[in-house]
């Protein structure tokens, strides 16, 4: 499904396309276009992928670009104002809405742009704790590629006063090379905490070939979240976890 | 501070159509879905169903040629209706914010929650 | 649909007890998982959402915690006011279900 509508609403109910009016060909001036995309229902997310062939005015996105925000509406959180020839990265919502701004000015036309909405799928469940005093955690399919569009929560738990060291044996995502305005791993990447995910302190966030070397955690609870984008899979990661313990009253579950 | 006040007939005979009314006061309205739970006597908790301040509906799969949630912005209020009863739907309706946004991004949990009201269904 | 498991159903503590409920999910939902406190002839309370985070004014004696199909509930040291039943809720997929109820009652 295709529309090329100046704004719409849309409730998903199989992945489409929405594009700027007249996209491949010279968008309109003085053209404002919104689209509501909506999830069925409060548990989906929605992801968006901007086709490569991504052309607007590029004059610090004074003139013409495209917005994203992540809610109902401009008050939804605010996720990237775009303009050039770079297109730019996936965008997954929060929630079940995302409100998409094009908005061109009188002069100075480009080719537009296109974009691919879809549920923001999990793939397959990949999801794991860990209790034993050592293990071995591998990204999906290892060391096939990788699937799409995951995110995966791994969760190392030990007793307290017992230190987990988490050494990567074979490291490869999808390279971020040139990254805007500081951030970094933006397609695929493992953010590491010690603790639990967004609650503990935040270890690192990788991807690339570079391996994160050997992790260190003292909490009793080492995290790791992989996320995958919709696109360019690569083999993922294998790694090794052990446990020093500190106090050996406590016993593994 | 977020409070929902529910209120409905408490007594119905089978066949009949249950019909309540959860009113919200404080907050935002637009922001969240808004939904219906039951609890039957001394059982566990049953999402019905939840709605949008535009309208858009989700039901329970379980109920949903039953239940109808509608919705008036205008009051930030929103009703159930769940058709042609039986005595198994003898229970306490609670109305409750469910997922929506706030501060800190899109949230998944039912908070807070109306008071609840005792439907019988009896003949 | 989603089926939440709880254990145990009744568990019998005193005051100062360290609680713990567990709660299982028949397929992964990530983290997210919530846990409610409801007393009789009151509507459910929310403790816990996201699996680990504290709710603003519930006391920090309550902790949650996992990810994926296995979560617990704990209550580090009882305290008279906890005498209730607790729920878990999965808010990872519709429709949202909850868990069959842990009753924890006086030893």
């Known amino acids: 499904f295709r529309n090329d509508k100046c704004g719409d609403t849309i409730k998903i109910e199989s992945p489409g396309y929405l594009t700027s009016p007249g996209y491949p060909h010279s968008y309109h001036p003085s053209e404002k276009c919104e689209w509501l995309i909506q999830a069925p229902d409060p548990y989906q997310r929605i992801m968006i992928n901007f086709n490569p062939h991504f052309d607007l005015e590029d004059r610090d996105c004074k003139y013409d670009y495209v917005e994203v925000f992540d809610g109902e509406n401009e008050n939804g959180h605010f996720r990237g104002k775009f303009c050039g020839k770079i297109a730019p990265p996936p965008v997954v919502s929060s929630g079940p809405f995302l409100f998409i701004k094009f908005v061109s000015d009188y002069e100075t036309h480009g080719a537009g742009f296109s974009i691919r909405y879809e549920i923001f799928k999990r793939g397959p469940e990949c999801s794991q704790n860990y209790t034993t005093p050592s293990g071995v955690i591998k990204s999906p399919g290892f060391p096939e590629k990788y699937p799409n569009s995951l995110e995966c929560t791994y969760i190392v738990f030990v007793p307290k006063m017992s230190e987990i060291i988490l050494e990567f044996e074979s490291f490869d995502l999808e390279p971020d090379s040139n990254p805007p305005g500081g951030m970094f791993c933006r397609y695929d990447r493992l953010e590491i905490w010690d603790g639990f995910p967004d609650v503990g302190p935040h270890i690192g966030r990788y991807c690339g070939q570079k391996t994160p070397g050997r992790i260190r955690s003292s909490s009793g609870i080492l995290s790791m979240v992989f996320y995958t984008d919709s696109a360019i899979a690569k083999e993922g990661f294998s790694a090794n976890y052990s446990v020093l313990q500190s106090s050996v009253s406590e016993d593994f579950k | 501070q977020v409070q929902l006040q529910q209120w409905g007939a408490g007594l119905l005979k089978p066949s009949e159509t249950l019909s309540l009314t959860c009113a919200v006061y404080?907050?935002?309205?637009?922001?969240?879905?808004w939904s219906w739970i039951r609890q039957p006597p001394g059982k566990g908790l049953e999402w019905i169903g939840d709605?949008?301040?535009?309208?858009?509906?989700n039901y329970n799969p379980s109920l949903k040629s039953r239940v109808t949630i509608s919705v008036d912005t205008s009051k930030n209020q929103f009703s159930l209706k769940l058709s042609s009863v039986t005595a198994a739907d003898t229970a306490v309706y609670y109305c409750?914010?469910?997922?929506?946004?706030?501060?800190?991004?899109?949230?998944?949990?039912?908070?807070?929650w109306g008071q609840g009201t005792l439907v019988t269904v009896s003949s | 649909d989603i089926q939440m498991t709880q254990s145990p159903s009744t568990l019998s503590a005193s005051v100062g007890d360290r609680v713990t409920i567990t709660c299982r999910a028949s397929?992964?939902?990530?983290?997210?998982l919530a846990w409610y406190q409801q007393k009789p002839g009151k509507a459910p309370k929310l403790l816990i959402y996201?699996?680990?985070s504290l709710e603003s004014g519930v006391p920090s004696r309550f902790s949650g915690s996992g990810s994926g199909t296995e979560f617990t509930l704990t209550i580090s040291s009882l305290q008279p006011d906890d005498f209730a039943t607790y729920y878990c809720?999965?808010?990872?997929?519709?429709?949202?279900?909850f868990g069959g109820g842990t009753k924890v009652e006086i030893k």
């Open positions: 409750a914010r469910g997922p929506g946004y706030d501060s800190s991004g899109y949230s998944r949990r039912f908070d807070p």
């Open positions: 404080g907050g935002s309205f637009v922001k969240y879905y």
């Open positions: 709605i949008w301040h535009s309208g858009m509906t």
């Open positions: 397929q992964s939902i990530s983290s997210w």
């Open positions: 996201k699996a680990s």
């Open positions: 809720q999965q808010l990872n997929s519709y429709p949202p279900t």
